[in-house]
C-alpha cells in the first residue's frame, strides 16, 4: 500500500479534526491501516489512535478527537500499515478550519415586505470562532436551483434581511447558508440545511 | 544550553514601525513554536501571538491583529517581530519565548521598544 | 477571554516560612487530562522564568522547595521554606483558551 500524495486535514476547531487520503490500490482501511496522533511540543502527551474508514475503495477518512483547541496546538500524525509507516507529519487545527455547518435556518416574515432569514452558528461565546465567522446565504429558485442570488454576511449577527420583491412571486425558493472563519486559515462549512417557502407578494397596479 | 537572545532596546518615534529580532541557540529551532509576549511598565504579561519556525503558521492575539506581524528566518534560526503604527502605547518590553505544550519554557533576554517624539 | 485572578497582590514571609499564592480561573482550565496552568517567577529587570507546568510538574532545575496544586479553577502555588532569593513576582498564566493569559501578579518580599 502506498499513500498518494499528502493526507488533506481539516478541524472543526471545536472537537473534531478529518484527515482523508489517497490510496494506489483498494483497501479496507479500518483493518488494514490506523492512524496515531498525539499533541506535540511535550514528551508526555497521550499517543492517540484514529481507526480510518472507507469513503471510497482507495480512500480513507479518519475523525480524530480534539477537543477544544487552540491556535498553538499542533499534532504529530503517523499512519501505519501494520507495522510500516506509511506516512508522517504533523497537523495544526488552526491552519485548516473548516466550521461546523449552521443549524436551524429560518424564515420570518418582516415588516415593510421584508423577508428575515436566521440561523444558529455552532460555536460557544469561549471559542475563538464565536465572534469570528462570516457566513453566505444561497436563495434558489426551487424548481431551478441555476437561478439564484448569494449574499455575502460579513457582520457577526446571525442573520439576514431582504426585500420580498426581490425575488420573483408566486415561487418556490429554497434558502441554506455556509460559514467560514475570517482570522483563522480554512475552507467554506458545509452548507446547512435547507429551507423552502413560497414567495407571494400582491404586485403594484401598475404591474397587474 | 537553550537560549533566546534578543535585540536591543529601540526609540521609534509615533507611527513609525519596529522590527525586533530572536535568534535561537541550543536546540533544533523548527521543532518548537516560538511566542511574543509583552509586557507594560509594571504590568503583567500579555500573549501577542505565535509562529511555527517550520512552516511559518501563525496566530495572534486579537488584540495585537494588525499591529504585529511575526516571521522567521530558518537559516539563521532567527524570529522577528514586527510592530507598525506605534503609539505610546506601545512603549514595553517585549519577549520571545520557546513554546512548550501550552506553556513557555525558556524566555528571551527582552527587547525595549519606548515610543516618544 | 479567561481571567486570571491572583491573591494577594503582595505578601511578606518571613525566612524559612511557607508562601501561599492562589490563582482563580474565571472558567476550568482542564482539557486533555492536564489542567493547562503553569506558573513563573520574574525578577526585576529579568524575564519571566518558569517554575510550575500543568499545575503541579516541578521545571527541570526548579528546587523542590516550590510546588504547585489544584484543578479547573483553583490552583496554588506554594514555597517551603522560603529563601532570600525568592523576593520576586509570581505570575500564573493558562492556555486553555485562546487567547493566553496571565495574572496580575504577586509580589513576594522576604522578611
Known amino acids: 500500500i502506498k499513500v498518494l500524495g499528502e493526507p488533506t486535514c481539516f478541524s472543526d476547531y471545536i472537537r473534531t479534526s478529518t484527515c482523508e487520503w489517497f490510496l494506489d490500490s483498494a483497501v479496507d482501511c479500518s483493518s488494514q491501516l490506523c492512524l496515531h496522533y498525539r499533541l506535540m511540543f511535550f514528551e508526555f502527551s497521550e499517543n492517540l489512535t484514529c481507526i480510518p474508514r472507507n469513503s471510497a475503495s482507495t480512500v480513507c477518512v479518519c475523525h480524530m478527537e480534539m477537543n477544544r483547541p487552540v491556535q498553538s496546538d499542533r499534532y504529530q500524525m503517523e499512519l501505519w500499515a501494520e507495522h510500516r509507516q506509511l506516512w508522517q507529519g504533523s497537523f495544526s487545527p488552526s491552519g485548516n478550519v473548516k466550521p461546523l455547518a449552521p443549524d436551524n435556518l429560518t424564515l420570518h416574515t418582516n415588516v415593510s415586505d421584508e423577508w428575515l432569514l436566521t440561523w444558529n452558528n455552532l460555536y460557544p461565546s469561549n471559542n475563538l470562532l464565536y465572534k469570528d465567522l462570516i457566513s453566505m446565504v444561497n436563495i434558489s429558485r426551487e424548481d431551478n436551483p441555476a437561478e439564484f442570488i448569494v449574499y455575502n454576511v460579513t457582520y457577526k449577527e446571525p442573520r439576514l434581511s431582504f426585500p420580498i420583491n426581490i425575488l420573483m412571486s408566486g415561487v418556490y425558493y429554497t434558502a441554506r447558508v455556509r460559514v467560514r472563519s475570517q482570522i483563522l486559515t480554512g475552507t467554506w462549512s458545509e452548507w446547512s440545511p435547507s429551507i423552502t417557502w413560497y414567495n407571494h407578494f400582491q404586485l403594484p397596479l401598475i404591474q397587474r | 544550553e537553550v537560549q533566546l537572545q534578543q535585540s536591543g532596546p529601540e526609540l521609534v518615534k509615533p507611527g513609525a514601525s519596529v522590527r525586533m529580532s530572536c535568534k535561537a541557540s541550543?536546540?533544533?529551532?523548527?521543532?518548537?513554536?516560538i511566542h511574543w509576549v509583552k509586557q507594560s511598565h509594571g504590568k503583567s504579561l500579555e500573549w501577542i501571538g505565535y509562529?511555527?519556525?517550520?512552516?511559518?503558521?501563525?496566530g495572534y492575539n486579537q488584540k495585537f491583529r494588525g499591529k504585529a506581524t511575526l516571521t522567521v528566518d530558518k537559516s539563521s534560526s532567527t524570529a522577528y517581530m514586527e510592530l507598525r503604527s506605534l503609539t505610546s502605547d506601545d512603549s514595553a518590553v517585549y519577549y520571545c519565548?520557546?513554546?512548550?505544550?501550552?506553556?513557555?519554557?525558556?524566555w528571551g533576554t527582552g527587547t525595549t521598544v519606548t515610543v516618544s517624539s | 477571554n479567561i481571567v486570571l485572578t491572583q491573591s494577594p497582590a503582595s505578601l511578606a514571609v518571613s525566612l524559612g516560612q511557607r508562601a501561599t499564592i492562589s490563582c482563580r480561573a474565571s472558567e476550568s482550565v482542564d482539557n486533555y487530562g492536564h489542567s493547562f496552568m503553569h506558573w513563573y517567577q520574574q525578577k526585576p529587570g529579568q524575564p519571566p522564568k518558569l517554575l510550575i507546568y500543568l499545575a503541579s510538574n516541578l521545571e527541570s532545575g526548579v528546587p523542590a522547595r516550590f510546588s504547585g496544586s489544584g484543578s479547573r479553577t483553583d490552583f496554588t502555588l506554594t514555597l517551603d521554606p522560603v529563601e532570600a532569593d525568592d523576593a520576586a513576582t509570581y505570575y500564573c498564566q493558562q492556555y486553555n483558551e485562546d487567547p493566553p493569559t496571565f495574572g496580575s501578579g504577586t509580589k513576594l518580599e522576604i522578611k
Open positions: 519565548a520557546r513554546g512548550r505544550l501550552r506553556y513557555f519554557d525558556v
Open positions: 541550543g536546540y533544533t529551532f523548527t521543532d518548537y513554536n
Open positions: 509562529i511555527y519556525p517550520n512552516n511559518g503558521d501563525n
